[in-house]
């Protein structure tokens, strides 16, 4: 299959991404134009036949003029200017602004909390399995296996710090060498980028928003994958990371430091610990082949325990088994010795929802996974809505200019590096690259930050998370200090190497181009985003894991042909776009391949069949609910079903469908307001600024 089906060159030529009559959504739908329109006073639109649904959202207006889909939308202000307001209006506007700010911070807080709980949920569902991945002895000899274990474990526990800490404890207890740990760390770096990709999926409702959000999230993925693609073979061949970090660790006499400051956790922990608390040591114990840990629950039951260290007398088979000759005696029949025993006495139970349920980890994990995804989705929608209403006119202009504008010549090149520092700093503050990049995703989606600017911020985030790890390493106890510091430094230098590869020269900023390409495909075929997520974060790592277990011969036997085909396709693709004349006529395009191998159209038809069935059920349910609601409140226009349902109804009736504006998943009242069903006075209270 061609790597980017139906895409020509990487240049942003929107014509290439259009299919049928329903083309690209104008990136910046002019909201002011829509505000007071009713359904029957629609601007002229191209009447088309309803195409197979590409996702759960409807298709949108045909653009009158085709824009670059990557241009940032101009969020125009529909409200009254500040100067034109009376005192009452100004006071009202001020309090509205304060209210919005409080709401924004509130939703942001729950967004971060839901990320934390999502991580806990993943650990409950797949934590023990993740721990068992580590207990595989082949990691030592197979760097590729180490890499995929790093990816899988981090994806399963949704936390690179958890997987890294397992690696550290394994290295410090000599179960793993630093050399074997490096590929796992690289894998953990890849695995941690899944979180913001999941967050981007939440913005699937609006095509252009999703294009930007998904590309902005996957730029992180591509950076990590490409870095590994280049640096893992280099590391295997030269062991440069191991050597450099060893020199650093040996040349400094590090004293145990303080713990990395938990800044964000201080605010979120009081809430998240009321939902669930986990005993993360269990995963580490499983990784270290502790048989007892396999039966332990990850859900923490006792939060206050009293640990009493006492010496007890125990019988031993012979004096050779004594702890020391001086601590050895007999009672005349048996030999005795003194042993240090730690008694753990449970004092107080934890105060979280699941403490008294005694449910299996999988059940708790599933419940939390669903709930956290719902909260995450809800918070994200609300954040986007609030930001959308705040970032209009002057405010948007100022913010966009501040974030996306470069320094004046000749210092323009420095802007990106400053962004890297900002990303690192912000990640250090929030103590999590996942949180930072996930918070960045909706901002990219709504068009506040360009992908070009998000890229260095993301790279900085990668650095920031490693500085946190270095601080944590310096705070670790004596025996673990060296190994944890060396691993943290490996992580740091890996990311530095990646930045040197894929950032300084604009030409080498491949992740941006790849992410944009994926963004275009995913905006058109939204199911492809989920497909990408499953393939890259689960299927490929699991396949490599399975083949590695089968042995080197099998891995090479399957891997070499696959790699060869990929290289062949890439070379052919490069020649097709750069110098097609070199190639024979047949190879100048992909038409020689069957349609299913070069286009996503046939696949889309299959997916549409499945999703269409689900969509019909969903809409029927929606319609029933709406009608019940309307009957109760005795108002014919009180409730409207989602746009997709109307389209489906009309399609069933065999009518031509005028494709509407992107209000698909918006709040009912807001969508009605946009279509002029709500009195215009409602929108007059809109504030332009906080």
């Amino acid at each position: 299959m061609a790597p980017w089906p139906e895409l020509g060159d990487a240049q942003p030529n929107p014509d290439k991404y259009l299919e049928g009559a329903a083309g690209q959504q104008p990136t910046a739908p002019d909201k002011s134009k829509e505000t007071n329109k009713t359904d029957n006073t629609e601007a002229p639109v191209t009447k088309i036949e309803l195409l197979p649904s590409y996702s759960t959202a409807t298709l949108i207006d045909e653009p009158t003029e085709v824009d670059d889909p990557w241009n940032l939308p101009t969020l125009q202000d529909s409200g009254i200017k500040w100067s034109e307001r009376d005192t009452k209006g100004k006071i009202l506007c001020f309090f509205q602004g304060i209210g919005r700010l409080i709401l924004l911070l509130g939703f942001l807080y729950f967004f971060v909390c839901s990320l934390d709980i999502l991580s806990s949920a993943f650990q409950l569902v797949g934590g023990k399995m993740a721990g068992q991945f580590f207990s595989n002895s082949s990691i030592m000899s197979n760097p590729l296996l180490g890499l995929v274990i790093g990816v899988l474990v981090t994806v399963l526990v949704q936390s690179s710090s958890t997987s890294t800490s397992i690696v550290v404890s394994m290295v410090s207890s000599s179960l793993l060498t630093v050399r074997a740990a490096i590929p796992i760390i690289m894998g953990a770096n890849i695995g941690t980028s899944i979180t913001n990709t999941i967050v981007a999926l939440m913005q699937v409702g609006d095509r252009s928003e999703f294009r930007r959000a998904f590309a902005g999230a996957t730029v992180h993925d591509f950076f990590n994958w490409l870095s590994v693609l280049v640096l893992l073979p280099v590391e295997v061949a030269t062991h440069y990371l191991e050597i450099i970090t060893q020199l650093i660790v040996e040349s400094f006499h590090f004293k145990n430091g303080e713990d990395a400051p938990d800044l964000l956790k201080v605010i979120t922990k009081p809430f998240t610990k009321l939902i669930v608390q986990l005993d993360k040591k269990v995963i580490s114990q499983i990784a270290m082949n502790d048989e007892k840990a396999k039966n332990k629950s990850l859900v923490k039951i006792w939060c206050k325990t009293f640990t009493n260290k006492t010496q007890i007398n125990v019988t031993v088979p012979s004096t050779a088994n004594c702890t020391s000759p001086s601590l050895c005696w007999t009672d005349g029949i048996q030999n005795w010795t003194m042993k240090n025993v730690t008694y753990k006495e449970n004092i107080a139970k934890c105060q979280h929802i699941f403490v008294n349920f005694h449910l299996p980890d999988l059940a708790v994990g599933t419940i939390l996974l669903i709930l956290s995804l719902l909260v995450l989705c809800g918070c994200l929608i609300m954040i986007v809505k609030i930001l959308g209403s705040v970032l209009k006119g002057q405010v948007a202009t100022v913010i966009k200019k501040t974030i996306n504008t470069d320094f004046p010549f000749p210092f323009a090149w420095l802007t990106g590096y400053l962004a890297i520092l900002v990303g690192a700093g912000m990640t250090f503050i929030v103590q999590s690259s996942s949180v930072f990049t996930s918070a960045l995703t909706p901002l990219i989606g709504i068009g506040v930050i360009t992908i070009e600017r998000a890229y260095p911020l993301t790279l900085g985030s990668n650095i920031g998370t490693t500085t946190t790890a270095i601080l944590a390493a310096l705070a670790s106890p004596g025996n673990a200090l060296r190994s944890s510091l060396q691993i943290a430094l490996c992580h740091f230098f890996f990311n530095i190497s990646g930045i040197l590869l894929w950032y300084p020269i604009p030409f080498t900023r491949l992740p941006i181009r790849m992410a944009k390409g994926l963004g275009n495909i995913s905006a058109k075929y939204r199911w492809f985003a989920v497909f990408y997520l499953i393939i890259f974060f689960f299927l490929i790592p699991l396949t490599v894991f399975g083949l590695s277990l089968a042995g080197w011969r099998v891995l090479v036997g399957v891997g070499v042909p696959v790699v060869f085909i990929i290289i062949l396709v890439l070379c052919l693709r490069l020649l097709q776009s750069r110098c097609p004349r070199v190639l024979p006529k047949k190879l100048q395009n992909w038409n020689f391949l069957p349609l299913w191998m070069r286009s996503l159209k046939p696949w889309d038809a299959v997916v549409s069949k499945f999703t269409g069935c689900f969509q019909m059920r969903c809409c029927c349910c929606c319609r029933v609910c709406c009608r019940a609601c309307c009957l109760l409140c005795d108002c014919p226009k009180c409730c409207r079903c989602s746009k997709c349902c109307e389209d489906l109804e009309e399609a069933q009736e065999g009518q031509d469908v005028p494709v509407k504006a992107p209000e698909t998943f918006d709040n009912i009242t807001i969508s009605r307001e946009a279509q002029g069903e709500v009195p215009a006075s409602d929108s007059k209270t809109e504030c332009t600024a906080l």
Partner: antibody, heavy 119, light 107 residues
């Protein structure tokens, strides 16, 4: 209170056997070892062996092995020491002593049984 | 077997005197040492175990010290009832062994 009461003095001929008993009370018989110690006239103390009445496990001093058999009857909380193939140098006071749990110190002793071997 | 050597074998002292009896082991026995008091015609009586721990009912004037190979029993102020023979015993390994005894007499 803990009490260990031993059987009375015995006079035996050389080559014969003798069984000395030690009846206990005031504690759980099966939880502590029972040691046997001998003291020849005007001499020091010498450990013969010990039995754990709970399981019947025994340990002997090599010097006495084969000539001493230690047994215990849980039903009567009584420990026994049988001395066989007696010689004149076996003449001594034989003590039973309760071992402290978990180590070899002896906290309670019987009054002693004098065994005299003479023809 | 571990040999225990007590010194002195005989000791004359007066009431109120401070008396020290030593016991040397042929090898390291840790603190697995006990001290007994035996009066003529009677069974031995446990005074000290674990080299330093006084058995219940034993007067505080009796104290034990030492570890490894050298141990001492100290009577801080001799009383008339303290005149007897004193034995040390090791229970570090089988067979359990006793010292030859120290006879404490009235001066």
């Amino acid at each position: 209170q803990v009490q260990l009461v031993q059987s009375g003095a015995e006079v035996v001929k050389p080559g014969a056997s003798v069984k000395v008993s030690c009846k206990t009370s005031g504690y759980t018989f099966t939880t502590n070892n029972m040691h046997w110690v001998r003291q020849a006239p005007g001499q020091g103390l010498e450990w013969i062996g010990a039995i754990y009445p709970g399981s019947g496990a025994t340990a002997y001093n090599q010097k006495f092995k084969g000539r001493v058999t230690l047994t215990a009857d849980k039903s009567t909380s009584t420990a026994y020491m049988e001395l066989s193939s007696l010689r004149s140098e076996a003449t001594a006071v034989y003590y039973c002593a309760r071992g402290m749990y978990g180590h070899g110190a002896m906290d309670y002793w019987g009054q002693g049984t004098l065994v005299t071997v003479s023809s | 077997d571990i040999q225990l050597t007590q010194s002195p074998s005989f000791l004359s002292a007066s009431v109120g005197d401070r008396v020290t009896i030593t016991c040397k082991a042929s090898q390291d026995v840790g603190t697995a040492v006990a001290w007994y008091q035996q009066k003529p015609g009677k069974a031995p009586k446990l005074l000290i175990y674990w080299a330093t721990t006084r058995h219940s009912g034993v007067p505080s004037r009796f104290s034990g010290s030492g570890s490894g190979t050298e141990f001492t029993l100290t009577i801080s102020s001799l009383q008339p009832e303290d005149f007897a023979t004193y034995y040390c015993q090791q229970y570090s390994s089988n067979p359990l062994t006793f010292g030859q005894g120290t006879k404490l007499e009235i001066k």
